[in-house]
Interface confidence: low
């Protein structure tokens, strides 16, 4: 009922709670002397469904038959309207529309851990939209019965608060849930189980790992479990991996040896437990243990390359370069690299440990046969050395690869191609493609990059440390035993016209011709590989087209003679530079007048 209903009543038949689709009769009746003040025939009773008028009647009572009410609660209010006054609320009623409960499905019970309590869950089925009470009943051996009720509108879980113990692990228990509301009741199918079926062990705890003799091959995982656990499953993975390795073990008694871990790798370990081979369920996974495996001596061999530079008649500079071992080869933190330089005929050897670098430069005599061995060392030992005999890599002209070309291949890639050397191509054991930024000074501090290619390959895609708008000096070496031949080319991955022209710094007169000298364009303004320089000149104050001389670009060249100028004529000269993409703007202009005799 709504409010105090002092003036009248609203009755609902057959009930305030009805089945979806049922018809309901609503009667609104005034109490004696509660109608309009003067004329009771003027009483106008109005029935509202929520705030919408659905029926009215003049008199002391109103009957209305209502159908098609939706699931849930509908509010009906009866009001009285008199002449010249506001409507007065008489009374109201709520009607609850719902359905009988469906049979609860998938009843399942679980006890978390040997000390936990039995809790059951089920699926309620569709919502009844009515107050529904659930009763969970558990019957066990010796006619024992436990019962628990749940009055929550959305009840699908109940904890009995009782603990099943393993005294009789095979004893049967039966659970059943019954749902009851005003429109009916329904019970689930019974669920029968034993202690072993429903006890779900707690996840293992106190997980530790031990490496005997600090060796990854002698690794034992330890953990603690509840007393009745029979089975464990272990899963582990490197921390940077998404894939787990899985191991199932029986009667592990809280320890298991792992044989396939990689050295110097952080792993994540988790363990789960179960009481019985085929009954019951696995525990949740334990909390993760994260641990790093110990180092092992490095495996694999360093990729080593070198450069020779002539210093003077008796000395040469050797620069050694090597690439880091992969993580799986280093098998630990590389503490230093050991470089051994040996003169093969005299047997003299020099060993040096290099820390923090992957290169080493030394000066040795030009005479003698020299070899180097480079190995990487971590806390457990050294990799086997890479041995290289130092030779003149470009000495064998017949081994030089032919028709070397370098073409841009997409963003920051250069495709290098070549033809095998004229000498028996089958003699080639491998090709090495080497590249470094071109610096006019031939700076030996510029980083060197290289890759090795099998003897049957005639192309290589270079992408490591390749920047746009930078020119690279690329060499292809063909190696055969203790001989090598090489060819070189300039290449870039992306180019455009240079940003500036060369700066003429001097013009000197020599026997009737002039020698122009210029400063190289800064590397960052070259915008790729330069192909040509152009020298332009024209008579001062003349409107004629300038003459020009085009010179092929050579790294070290920074002067050029011109012998077609007339004496005692003042000329204006300037220079430009060209890449494959176009010509730079002018460099500076210089005036010059040749003093020599006229022809």
């Amino acid at each position: 009922k709504i409010d105090a209903c002092k003036r009248g009543d609203v009755t609902v038949k057959p009930s305030h709670v009805i089945l979806l689709g049922s018809t309901v009769n609503i009667t609104c009746s005034l109490k004696p002397r509660q109608g309009c003040f003067h004329y009771s025939r003027r009483n106008k009773l109005i029935l509202y469904k929520f705030d919408r008028r659905i029926n009215f009647h003049h008199g002391h009572s109103l009957n209305s038959q209502v159908t098609g009410l939706p699931l849930g609660t509908t509010l009906f209010v009866c009001k009285l309207a008199c002449i010249n006054s506001d409507e007065i609320q008489i009374c109201g009623a709520e009607i609850f529309v719902g359905v009988a409960p469906e049979q609860p499905q998938n009843l399942s019970c679980i006890q978390k851990g040997e000390q936990g309590t039995v809790a059951c869950t089920w699926e309620r089925g569709r919502d009844t939209h009515l107050y529904t009470e659930y009763t969970l009943q558990l019957s066990g051996p010796k006619n024992l019965t436990w019962q628990k009720q749940c009055k929550d509108i959305y009840c699908d879980y109940l904890d009995f608060g009782i603990n099943l113990t393993p005294e009789s692990p095979e004893s049967n228990f039966t659970a059943k849930v019954t749902a009851v509301n005003s429109l009916g009741s329904s019970s689930s199918l019974p669920s029968t189980f034993t202690f072993l079926d429903i006890v779900r062990p707690l996840p293992p705890w106190d997980i530790r790992i031990k490496f005997q003799k600090a060796s990854v091959s002698r690794c034992t995982l330890y953990w603690r479990d509840e007393g009745l656990v029979l089975l464990n499953r272990l899963r582990y993975r490197p921390s940077n991996s998404r894939l787990w390795n899985m191991v199932n073990v029986t009667k592990a008694k809280g320890r298991h040896d792992l044989l396939d871990l990689k050295p110097f790798t952080e792993y994540e370990f988790q363990i789960s437990s179960k009481l019985h081979l085929y009954k019951g369920s696995w525990s949740d996974w334990s909390e993760s243990l994260r641990a790093q495996t110990p180092e092992e001596e490095p495996t694999g061999m360093l990729d080593v390359w070198y450069m020779k530079r002539h210093i003077d008649y008796s000395r040469q500079q050797i620069s050694l370069f090597w690439k880091n071992l992969s993580v799986s080869e280093a098998r630990g933190k590389i503490l230093h690299y050991q470089v051994t330089l040996q003169e093969l005929t005299g047997g003299k050897a020099m060993t040096q440990n290099i820390t923090g670098h992957t290169s080493w430069t030394t000066v040795i005599p030009r005479t003698g046969n020299w070899a180097v061995a480079v190995s990487a060392a971590n806390s457990k030992g050294s990799s086997l050395p890479t041995r290289i005999n130092i030779m003149n890599l470009c000495e064998a002209g017949l081994l030089a690869p032919r028709q070397v070309s370098a073409n841009s291949e997409g963003m920051d890639n250069i495709l290098v191609t070549w033809q095998p050397p004229r000498k028996d191509p089958s003699a080639v054991q491998e090709y090495v493609v080497e590249w470094r930024e071109l610096h006019p000074g031939g700076d030996t501090q510029v980083p060197l990059n290289w890759l090795r290619s099998r003897p049957y390959n005639v192309s290589a895609l270079i992408s490591e440390n390749i920047k746009s708008y930078i020119c690279y000096e690329i060499r292809v070496y063909a190696l055969s035993g203790d001989q090598g031949g090489c060819s070189s080319i300039l290449g870039n991955s992306k180019h455009k016209a240079p940003l500036s022209g060369p700066h003429i710094n001097a013009i000197t007169e020599e026997k009737g011709s002039i020698l122009i000298s210029w400063n190289s364009i800064p590397v960052q303004e070259q915008m790729g590989c330069l192909l040509h320089y152009r020298i332009y000149w024209k008579e001062r104050d003349s409107n004629s087209q300038p003459q020009l001389c085009e010179i092929p670009y050579r790294v070290s060249q920074n002067s050029h003679p011109i012998n077609s100028l007339q004496p005692r004529v003042t000329y204006v000269l300037w220079m430009t530079a060209l890449t494959a993409a176009g010509e730079s703007s002018h460099g500076n202009e210089r005036e010059f007048c040749l003093q020599g005799k006229a022809n």
């Epitope: 001596e297 495996t299 190995s375 030992g381 050294s382 990799s383 086997l384 041995r387």
Partner: nanobody, 116 residues
């Protein structure tokens, strides 16, 4: 101090076999990579083979690959070189060395002569 004693050399016909041993003392043998090197008459030292400290990884110079096998017994502090299909060009003094490069301490060597 480091002591290395090679043994097992001798005269053998081409195609024959020999096993050289190297007894080590004075250092932690099981923590060191080891190698075999040789010196043919009138020539410089030539690296032959290396073996990692645990014995799991071995490397050989091309000319002996498939014919020679290096092994070690860390419990006995002994290094071995099993030589099969011997050729006249294998004639040399063979040394074991306390390093993976062959440039470390060496023993006195053992003479291997391959001749018919």
């Amino acid at each position: 101090q480091v002591q290395l004693q090679e043994s097992g050399g001798g005269l053998v016909q081409p195609g024959g076999s020999l096993t050289l041993s190297c007894a080590a003392s004075g250092f932690t043998f099981s923590s060191n990579a080891m190698s075999w090197v040789r010196q043919a008459p009138g020539k410089g030292l030539e690296w032959v083979s290396s073996i990692s400290s645990g014995g799991g990884t071995t490397y050989y110079t091309d000319s002996v690959k498939g014919r020679f096998t290096t092994a070690r017994d860390n419990a006995k502090n002994t290094l071995y070189l099993r030589m099969n299909s011997l050729k006249p060009e294998d004639t040399a003094v063979y040394y074991c060395s306390k390093s993976s490069t062959g440039s470390g301490s060496r023993g006195q060597g053992t003479q291997v002569t391959v001749s018919s």
